[in-house]
């Protein structure tokens, strides 16, 4: 959900606190306020169609609403690319588009949108129950996917609405560890202002804005997919059998992270971009692959002529590769 | 810098199969989908085939299904293309590229004779 | 398939003249969900592979001299050399990057006076 919150105007402190606190202890609630609350949160969303001319055949359309620019999407089935899930289609803003049986035909829609039409026919097409996951690498957002399926009882011609991912999953420890930061800073935020003023702290209220406000052609997300919110990573089957729902968690991990509140999750940037870098909302997770800026220290891509899902040992403007970033 | 080092030469009879190595370095082999080109003496490029090192996926131009396959070994961070059936159309030097085509191969050139 | 179809086959210039050459799609490359045409331009020195030049039809891939400049919308393609040097001596090839399979044009031969 794209909620934004309302902040009630904030008073500075009162002149008999500004001696015990002092300038100084003021300026970190007053960045952590500002952080939680200008903190954005891109979506994905995904919406699946079974064609009604072809019963076997599908029509996915991702979209990425977000501020950032996208410098790559890859789209599976089955699961998210790197989590068992099989590769349909790659396509890079600039550089083009690859894609895999029985993708038929990739394309953008719109500079944040995608669709994918798939064959209906031979062993590897999709059935009803199978699941399809877009992922979309921005800067500066960095990784974001969802996933979606059919309805069990879709019409031909019917398409499921979009869903925006139902899990949060972070590939890399810091993620979690600047959202822990975030999060305890806002405790501390709120702690301060209970402790040192006469008043109640404010709250933040979520906006009275509609979940659904302008999306990019008013799509609308499922409902069900916010109530699989608890569930840190669905895997449907693809066979055409009936779904099985997998919580799945990191190899050979404790589930520790299941529990996390999806909307914690956020990526640090760099030294002095991380303050405005977005915060995964609800009905998105954030994923950002191990290898991606991790090479020789290079900075987060910028997808000047075209970034690539995967690191790109030539520089800044090399890196727009393939799969994800070049 | 990334490099692309392809095995050398292969002269092979017809009937037979060779399989072309490809070792990646440089770079994330697993989140860059490597493409192999075949190129004949004196002639242009023909796209074979593209696959996700990450996952094994393949996808090949319908022209090469049957006659080329794609795979990758994460731990080298290897492709290979194999080609079965050999005759003297498959005489040619092939290429690996990865980066959306931006870095190439050496090639490898492929001989099919009696 | 897509058809890629270069022009002319093979031209032969002086060192500093300006030289275009033409690649037509027998598709349009255009998406036009995002406005960008997926064609690039390779370049292939003998006994060398191809080195990519430009991608989404304009845009020098990094390292590229600037005297090479990619141009056209659509079905229409045109690659330039503003000053041709002695070691623009190759072939050029031009690539469908938007349709499976991604197709190569015939290649146009630059042969230095």
């Known amino acids: 959900m794209r909620t934004e919150a309302q902040v009630p105007a904030l008073q500075p402190p009162e002149p008999g606190l500004e001696g015990a606190m002092g300038h100084r202890t003021l300026v970190l609630p007053w960045v952590l306020l500002t952080l939680c609350v200008t903190a954005g949160t891109p979506e994905v969303w995904v919406q699946v169609r079974m064609e009604a001319t072809e019963l076997s055949s599908f029509t996915i359309r991702c979209g990425f609403l977000g501020s950032g620019s996208i410098s790559l999407v890859t789209v599976s089935w089955g699961g998210p690319n790197g989590a068992g899930g099989t590769t349909l289609a790659v396509l890079h803003p600039e550089r083009g588009i690859r894609q895999w049986a029985p993708a038929r035909q990739a394309r953008w829609e719109t500079q944040s949108s995608i669709s994918l039409i798939l064959e209906g026919s031979g062993a590897s097409s999709p059935c009803a129950n199978t699941t399809f996951c877009c992922k979309f690498a921005s800067f500066p957002e960095g990784s974001w996917e969802a996933c979606g399926s059919l309805p069990p009882s879709s019409d031909p011609g019917l398409s499921a609405p979009p869903t925006p991912a139902p899990i949060l999953r972070a590939d890399l420890a810091g993620i979690l560890g600047v959202s822990g930061v975030l999060l305890f800073g806002c405790v501390y935020l709120l702690h301060l202002l209970r402790r040192h003023k006469h008043r109640p702290a404010p709250r933040l209220q979520p906006s009275r804005t509609s979940p659904q406000a302008p999306r990019a052609r008013a799509w609308a997300p499922s409902q069900a997919s916010q109530a699989a919110l608890h569930v840190p990573y669905a895997t449907i089957n693809t066979s055409c059998r009936p779904a099985t729902l997998d919580t799945a968690h990191p190899h050979g991990g404790p589930s520790w992270w299941a529990s996390l509140p999806t909307h914690a999750a956020h990526r640090p940037q760099g030294p002095a971009a991380w303050a405005s870098t977005p915060i995964p909302a609800r009905g998105s997770f954030v994923s950002v692959e191990n290898g991606l800026y991790a090479q020789a220290g290079e900075r987060p891509p910028h997808t000047g002529p075209g970034l690539t899902l995967f690191p790109d040992p030539r520089g800044p403007r090399a890196m727009e590769g393939p799969l994800g970033v070049r | 810098q990334v490099q692309l080092q392809q095995s050398g030469a292969e002269l092979v009879r017809p009937g037979t199969s060779v399989k072309v190595s490809c070792k990646a370095s440089?770079?994330?082999?697993?989140?860059?989908?490597i493409e192999w080109v075949k190129q004949r003496p004196g002639q242009g490029l023909e796209w074979i085939g593209v696959?996700?090192?990450?996952?094994?996926?393949?996808n090949y131009n319908e022209k090469f299904k049957g006659k080329a396959t794609l795979t990758a070994d994460k731990s080298s961070t290897t492709a290979y293309i194999q080609l079965s059936s050999l005759t003297s159309d498959d005489s040619a030097v092939y290429f690996c590229?990865?980066?959306?085509?931006?870095?190439w191969g050496q090639g490898t050139l492929v001989t099919v004779s009696a | 398939d897509i058809v890629m179809t270069q022009s002319p086959s093979s031209l032969s210039v002086s060192a500093g003249e300006k030289v275009t050459m033409s690649c037509k799609s027998s598709?349009?490359?255009?998406?036009?969900?995002?406005?960008?045409?997926?064609l690039a331009w390779y370049q292939q020195k003998p006994g060398q592979p191809p080195k990519l030049l430009i991608y989404?039809?304009?845009t020098r891939e990094s390292g590229v001299p600037d005297r090479f400049t990619g141009s056209g919308s659509g079905t229409d393609f045109t690659l330039t050399i503003s000053s041709v040097q002695a070691e623009d001596l190759a072939v050029y090839y031009c690539?469908?990057?938007?349709?499976?399979?991604?197709?190569f044009g015939g290649g146009t031969k630059l042969e230095i006076k």
């Open positions: 696959i996700n090192p990450g996952s094994g996926d393949a």
């Open positions: 598709q349009s490359l255009l998406s036009s969900g995002n406005q960008k045409n997926y």
């Open positions: 590229a990865s980066h959306w085509l931006a870095y």
């Open positions: 989404g039809a304009s």
């Open positions: 690539q469908n990057g938007h349709f499976y399979p991604y197709t």
């Open positions: 440089g770079y994330a082999f697993i989140n860059n989908f």
